[in-house]
Interface confidence: low
């Protein structure tokens, strides 16, 4: 059924648990999936007393919850781990919490880094 308007080929990658999982800590991830399946980017993070702690970022396989989302917006009210997904290259660089029940929108800017490419 096609890849959709905002085709995703690459995402920002991050893994807070990189030491244990034996991966790079951060960089760029090339997304690979089955033909005719859509690809997305995602971000997950915690908000500990106002301190934003990234958990993971990367590619996310075909998920209707992510369709046609150009921005990475978490909508759950007050989870322990926030999650958002989106379509479009590097769309998970910035991520936002906008609860469905209303309330202030909070956008998180990533710190400047020199990412490495993950293959």
């Amino acid at each position: 059924s096609g890849r959709g308007e905002a085709e995703t080929r690459e995402c920002i990658y991050y893994n807070a648990n990189w030491e244990l999982e034996r991966t790079n800590q951060s960089g760029l991830e090339r997304c690979e999936g089955e033909q005719d399946k859509r690809l997305h980017c995602y971000a997950s993070w915690r908000n500990s007393s106002g301190t934003i702690e990234l958990v993971k970022k990367g590619c996310w396989l075909d998920d209707f919850n992510c369709y046609d989302r150009q921005e990475c917006v978490a909508t759950e009210e007050n989870p322990q781990v926030y999650f958002c997904c989106c379509e479009g290259n590097f769309c998970n660089e910035r991520f936002t919490h906008l609860p469905e029940a209303g309330g202030p929108e909070v956008t998180y800017e990533p710190p400047p880094t020199a990412p490495t490419l993950l293959t």
């Epitope: 648990n17 030491e19 244990l20 999982e21 781990v81």
Partner: antibody, heavy 117, light 107 residues
Framework: MQLVQSGGGLVQPGRSLGLSCTAS????????MSWVRQAPGKGLEWVGF??????????EYAASVKGRLTISRDDSKSIAYLQMNSLRAEDTAVYYC?????????WGQGTTVTVSS | DIQMTQSPSSLSASVGDRVTITCRAS??????LNWYQQKPGKAPKLLIY???RLQRGVPSRFSGSGSGTDFTLTISSLQPEDFATYYC?????????FGQGTKLEIK
Amino acid sequence: MQLVQSGGGLVQPGRSLGLSCTASGFTFGDYAMSWVRQAPGKGLEWVGFIRSKAYGGTTEYAASVKGRLTISRDDSKSIAYLQMNSLRAEDTAVYYCARGHYGMDVWGQGTTVTVSS
Amino acid sequence: DIQMTQSPSSLSASVGDRVTITCRASQNISNFLNWYQQKPGKAPKLLIYSASRLQRGVPSRFSGSGSGTDFTLTISSLQPEDFATYYCQQSYSTPYTFGQGTKLEIK
């Protein structure tokens, strides 16, 4: 990769005691550092952790120790500290430091703290 | 706080047996679940992290599974050095919490 603990011993209720955890063999500043304790004959109890400076060096504590125990770190010396104030009999335990907080993969040898008059 | 409940609390088994220990969280913790082994007088040792990932240096007879609230640690063929106490621990939400432990004894 090694964590070597020091401090501990016998202390009276209400008094203070400090524990140290000296790291070697890895880049200490990149890691969160955790403390876990084990009362005699009991299971493991999470005490708290301190994040790396990249995450602000902020701390999290168990409710049972909040306000009395303080975790700090000195990245230049590769040492994590646990300062214990207003000690109670129920704080008697073996205290362990450990690397990381999502999963604690390197542990110190443990040090015994006995709170008794 | 999230409660972690292990079962059984103790278990007798023989060398070569297949052993399963379960851990249940009081709420969804995704895969933020670790398993530790502890022998008397020693520090705990990380066996499994992220519910199913084997820590480097840990024998492949150990495996972990589960997600959400129900988790399992399996030892496929018990060896003499495996007799110890095993703990699960969630690192999803602070305060992090451990299960009460499962003591694995020789039958």
